[in-house]
């Protein structure tokens, strides 16, 4: 007796692992026996080479290699997702459609969310090495290695939780180099190696002692740039402080610093930097033309002492250390438009108050300069005759004009209807190119 198709075996979600083919099964009943057709993301598969899919007589779909992700459907943005397969079973009485089965490929990214850090632990105390593995599909598992060998986990002493290694009681034998290894079917990734040192316990009680420490930040001095660091280094300061209180000193000192906001404004968050010194140290990576607040905090292990007083220092503005970018010249109606983009923020060296624009001699404009005040990044210059127009632009801070841009030129031809700025796709004319062209 004739009957419409019914799906008996639905395809299942699976991971394409290669090198062998992936199989998607689909079995259906019905009279006359139904024909099987497969769809990927709702689109019928051609099964014609070079399509990597192949249909077996029993309706099983063979996938010889992962399909291109050309028609990934809405909302999917991970390289792991290859699509959803459905099978249709049809005879003259109707069509049955299976559930969708997702095919994905194993992926393991390279970047750890949290890398284990070097640390000092105390005998008998607990310590934790943190590790956040890279994203992976399937989700990776984490194992720990010590001194190049898998760490033998001892119940009650070692616990791995959420990637992190918790050591219940540190022993001298725990000293060594630890590495976190993330593994899934796509492969494995190794974290950085973290050095763990184990110290004997001290006689004094660290946190209580630390609370009694008093730090006086005495001065903050702008350092003269080191010539070895090149012509335009970021500013650095020298911090000096005095420690009073108990005999037991802090193990380390941290500088806290931030840019000062306008009076009444909410303070910026404090940035922190470990200092390499016990009474004075250098702090770098600051920015010219900013007002900074500084303070110092003592610490010992995980314990922190009270912060020092705050000192203020205004770093002077410098001239910008890079020229404006993307300088262009465009012809207007009896004018030439000059436009540009500010130098990169890291090269401002203060507040950009405006721009200086120069015309260069030996062109149709006599040597001249213009000042553009504020944030404006364009200038209109009146032109009275055809010929060549060449300009340079420099950004200006309170310290003066910075490095000028390379000369950019525009050739206005006689009829004024055609202006050339980009010879043979090589960008704006340089003065050298223009001279060569005029000679020709």
């Amino acid at each position: 007796q004739d009957s419409p198709p019914q799906i008996l075996v639905h395809p299942q979600d699976q991971l394409f692992q290669g090198p062998g083919p992936a199989r998607m099964s689909c079995q259906a009943s019905g009279q006359p026996p139904p024909t099987i057709r497969w769809l990927l993301n709702g689109q019928p598969l051609s099964m014609v080479p070079p399509d990597p899919h192949h249909l077996l007589p029993d309706g099983t779909l063979l996938l010889l290699q992962p399909p291109a992700r050309g028609h990934a459907h809405d909302g999917q943005a991970l390289s792991t997702d290859l699509g959803v397969y459905t099978c249709e079973a049809s005879n003259r009485l109707g069509t049955a459609v299976s559930r969708g089965a997702r095919l994905s490929v194993a992926v393991l990214r390279e970047d750890f969310q949290i890398q284990p850090r070097d640390m000092v632990a105390v005998v008998g105390e607990q310590f934790t090495l943190e590790c956040g593995p890279p994203w992976g599909h399937p989700e990776p598992t984490v194992s720990w290695w010590k001194d190049g060998k898998p760490l033998a986990l001892q119940p009650g002493r070692h616990t791995v939780s959420g990637g992190s290694l918790l050591m219940a009681r540190a022993e001298k034998s725990d000293e060594g180099t630890y590495m976190c290894v993330a593994t899934n079917s796509a492969g494995h990734r190794e974290s950085r190696a973290a050095r763990v040192s184990i110290q004997e316990p001290q006689d004094y009680t660290e946190p209580v002692e630390l609370l009694a420490v008093r730090i006086q930040l005495e001065n903050v001095t702008l350092l003269n740039p080191d010539p070895a660091e090149g012509p335009k280094p970021r500013p650095a300061v020298w911090l000096s402080w005095k420690v009073s209180g108990p005999a037991a000193p802090a193990q380390s000192y941290t500088a806290l610093f931030r840019t000062q906001t306008a009076p009444g404004g909410q303070g910026a968050p404090w940035a922190e930097e470990l200092l390499a010194g016990w009474q004075s140290a250098e702090l770098g990576g600051l920015h010219w033309g900013q007002d900074y607040e500084f303070k110092v905090r003592p610490s010992s292990g995980r314990a922190r002492g009270p912060d020092s007083n705050v000192l203020l220092l205004r770093l002077p503005e410098k001239v910008p250390s890079a020229p404006p970018q993307e300088v262009t010249l465009k012809p207007g109606n009896g004018t030439v438009f000059v436009s540009w983009v500010p130098p990169p923020a890291e090269n401002h060296n203060g507040i950009i108050r405006g721009y200086q624009v120069w015309s260069l001699g030996n062109t149709s404009l006599p040597p001249a300069n213009w000042t553009v005040v504020g944030e404006q990044t364009q200038l209109e210059i009146a032109t009275h005759m055809p010929g060549s127009y060449c300009v340079q632009v420099a950004a200006v801070t309170g310290a003066g004009a910075g490095e000028p841009s390379r000369p950019v030129c525009l050739l206005l031809e006689q009829a004024m209807e055609r202006a050339t700025q980009e010879p043979s796709e090589h960008g704006p004319w340089t003065l050298e190119q223009l001279r060569a062209t005029l000679k020709r």
Partner: antibody, heavy 118, light 112 residues
Framework: EVQLVESGGGLVQPGGSLRLSCAAS????????MSWVRQAPGKGLEWVAT????????YYPDSVKGRFTISRDNAKNTLYLQMNSLRAEDTAVYYC???????????WGQGTLVTVSS | DIVMTQSPLSLPVTLGEPASISCRSS???????????LNWYLQKPGQSPQLLIY???NRFSGVPDRFSGSGSGTDFTLKISRVEAEDVGVYYC?????????FGPGTKVDIK
Amino acid sequence: EVQLVESGGGLVQPGGSLRLSCAASGFTFSTYAMSWVRQAPGKGLEWVATISNGGTYTYYPDSVKGRFTISRDNAKNTLYLQMNSLRAEDTAVYYCARLIYYDYLDYWGQGTLVTVSS
Amino acid sequence: DIVMTQSPLSLPVTLGEPASISCRSSQSLENSNGNTYLNWYLQKPGQSPQLLIYRVSNRFSGVPDRFSGSGSGTDFTLKISRVEAEDVGVYYCLQVTHVPWTFGPGTKVDIK
């Protein structure tokens, strides 16, 4: 179409607890890491928590560590944020957002308001 | 923790004119593999944030090409080549290179 719908916000007293939910649809929830981000009234955005695609790995800033717990039920396509020992400074609109790997948050829900006040 | 700062905090713009927002981090956002995870979001009034740029310079799908991102290390810039009325709102940078992830304070862009 990717959709994220938060729920569970409301008024709670300091020291109290609340559980937020985020129902996800339009994508394969189990392959995506997810995050919660909050925004106090009239203020900027603050990252609150992230959970890996399988739920094994979780990450928090110090401001909520030990008080908030992010979790997920991949069978129900739902993300959760359990908030305990709530403080006035936890008052904010809480958004759930989908992560592409751990690279960027691409889709965000409309947010649910949590008010902590006596 | 990485501190993100943005400038300016407020940016009045003229329709059709370019605009530029700077984002600066207290440490380099380039990790040991050479990858930099710095993203830009726009939060329009009364709406959830929406992704504009990911990994410094990649425009998210559907984002107009007048938006572009650039930068490296600690200094990053979002540029709008010609501001349109629909671009008003608060722009945030977000770093996800280092846990904890941190947002910039936001730059409010409105029309002059």
